[in-house]
């Protein structure tokens, strides 16, 4: 803790400004009113304080707000956010998307830190659900965000938010996560016509059941092999050779290259050899 010293005459801070970078740690502690600091947090980021000086400023805010900073302070933390621990952040009540964006901006370009993960968790829990604007924001900063959530957490995503999801946001999702997201996507895109619908639903198909794949095979969708390989094995197995041929269209030839990999391998083993031969790809059941 900074030693107990009275502020030297004439050094009491009236503003948060550049002159404070010349203050020793104990002078910052003694001469800067925590209430002034809280009000002028937006100025801190424009001043090249040392890490040690930032520690003093954080300590002052912690003393004034031991139960958690108000949002008016949080929104302007800037790079002081990097000094916060997950324990600090758990005390916050962040309700404004602007506040969330401001803090994510500070961490931009870095992996999702424990601090950011805690911040997002506090924000989403405070909102009660992962709405479209929040999802838009989070996936813009962290494309893998959606796939970092548990199936239980994903269940709070309303179908309307699915419109914010881009294919790359689902790259690292596992089948359990897609099982939760697919029905939401199906609901969200239900009023679109065939080809537009397929473009939107394609990246969610890893959660699709057999009956939906059968329905898609009737729509000339020409699914690519990459999408087909991500389908649930249990959903693919009941498909007939004719249905797979219709589902893949011109991409059916790609099955040969994937014949040793799931779900293609397991599907081939379920088919009659006569049916496989109609594809003319030399697939052996």
């Amino acid at each position: 803790e900074v030693e107990k010293t009275a502020c030297p005459s004439g050094k009491k801070a009236r503003e948060i400004d550049e002159s404070l970078i010349f203050y020793k740690k104990w002078e910052l502690e003694a001469c800067v009113d925590a209430a002034l600091l809280a009000t002028q947090m937006d100025r801190v980021n424009a001043i090249p304080f040392t890490y040690e000086q930032l520690d003093v400023l954080k300590h002052k805010l912690d003393e004034l707000y031991p139960q958690g900073y108000p949002e008016s302070v949080i929104q302007h933390l800037g790079y002081l956010f990097l000094k916060m621990s997950p324990e600090d952040i758990r005390k916050w009540n962040v309700t404004s998307l602007e506040t969330l964006k401001a803090l994510l901006e500070v961490n931009k370009g870095h992996e999702m830190s424990p601090q950011v993960a805690t911040l997002i968790d506090r924000f989403v829990k405070g909102r009660g659900q992962l709405d479209k604007d929040t999802l838009d924001t989070l996936t813009a900063f962290y494309p893998g965000y959606l796939c970092s959530l548990s199936p239980e957490e994903l269940s709070s995503v309303p179908p309307s938010s699915i419109w914010a999801v881009r294919p790359q946001d689902l790259d690292t999702c596992d089948p359990r996560q897609l099982d939760v997201l697919y029905p939401k996507a199906r609901l969200a895109f239900q009023n679109m016509n065939g080809s537009e619908y397929f473009v939107k639903i394609q990246s969610f198909l890893g959660g699709a059941p057999t009956e939906d794949l059968k329905a898609l095979s009737q729509q000339n969708v020409s699914m690519d092999l990459a999408t087909f390989m991500k389908l649930r094995t249990d959903a693919v197995l009941p498909l007939t050779v004719a249905e797979v041929q219709k589902l893949l269209g011109p991409h059916v030839e790609g099955l040969k290259a994937e014949e040793r990999h799931r779900p293609v391998r397991d599907w081939i083993l379920r088919q009659r050899q006569d049916d496989l031969d109609t594809l003319g790809l030399g697939l052996q059941g």
Partner: antibody, heavy 117, light 110 residues
Framework: QVQLVESGGGLVQPGGSLRLSCSAS????????MGWVRQAPGKGLEYIGT???????YYASWAKGRFTISRDNSKNTLYLQMNSLRAEDTAVYYC???????????WGQGTLVTVSS | DIQMTQSPSTLSASVGDRVTITCQAS??????LAWYQQKPGKAPKLLIY???TLASGVPSRFSGSGSGTEFTLTISSLQCDDAATYYC????????????FGGGTKVEIK
């Protein structure tokens, strides 16, 4: 249920000393900053001082020198040592838990100190 | 040290009235101001902190506003239970805690 209970008040002669205690139940005092506030009969509230979590003490300018705030974490108790007491120190003395943004959210019921010959 | 000046010192109003109490600081305290309610023989009760944040369990008819040196406590619709003395509290948080309370405003029901 969180409760603060002050004790140690009573009649004391001018120039005398008194130590007030504030014992807590339902909260760990070491996890909070704590303060003392007094109220003379029929008058308003007057701030005495605060001890923070790290043990640093802040006093009102008038209280420096005569009044000392301390805590014993093992006994979960806050203290106010008052020396060189005067008639104008007659008041109800409250201990209170510092909450947030300069405020005190939990107060004891108060203990009356009467300085009189 | 900072001085806090409250006005009026006493006010009388009817149930349902909108009541306003003002508090002036001798120098800027930014937004770090609290309001308390005290009834005779009882300890003060925290109503509002950080100028406008309602403490837990406080009815929404109480609200606070202001910044710098001028602050206001408003009771939107006075109730019988609101008869009490109200105190503002502000301060300076640096090498000392220059905390000060206002002189109090006694609210009576007509």
């Amino acid at each position: 249920q969180v409760q603060l209970v002050e004790s140690g008040g009573g009649l004391v002669q001018p120039g005398g000393s008194l130590r007030l205690s504030c014992s807590a139940s339902g909260i760990d005092l070491s996890s909070y900053a704590m303060g003392w506030v007094r109220q003379a009969p029929g008058k308003g509230l007057e701030y005495i001082g605060t001890i923070n979590i790290g043990g640093r003490v802040y006093y009102a300018s008038w209280a420096k020198g005569r009044f000392t705030i301390s805590r014993d974490n093992s006994k979960n108790t806050l203290y106010l040592q008052m020396n060189s007491l005067r008639a104008e120190d007659t008041a109800v003395y409250y201990c209170a838990r510092y909450y947030n943004g300069g405020s005190y959210d939990i107060w004891g019921q108060g203990t009356l100190v009467t300085v009189s010959s | 040290d900072i001085q806090m000046t409250q006005s009026p010192s006493t006010l009388s109003a009817s149930v349902g009235d909108r009541v306003t109490i003002t508090c002036q600081a001798s120098e800027s305290i930014y937004r770090v101001l609290a309001w308390y309610q005290q009834k005779p023989g009882k300890a003060p009760k925290l109503l509002i902190y950080d100028t406008s944040t309602l403490a837990s369990g406080v009815p929404s008819r109480f609200s606070g506003s202001g910044s710098g040196t001028e602050f206001t406590l408003t009771i939107s619709s006075l109730q019988c239970d609101d008869a009490a003395t109200y105190y503002c509290q502000g301060g300076y948080y640096a090498d000392s805690y220059g905390i000060a309370f206002g002189g109090g405003t006694k609210v009576e029901i007509k």
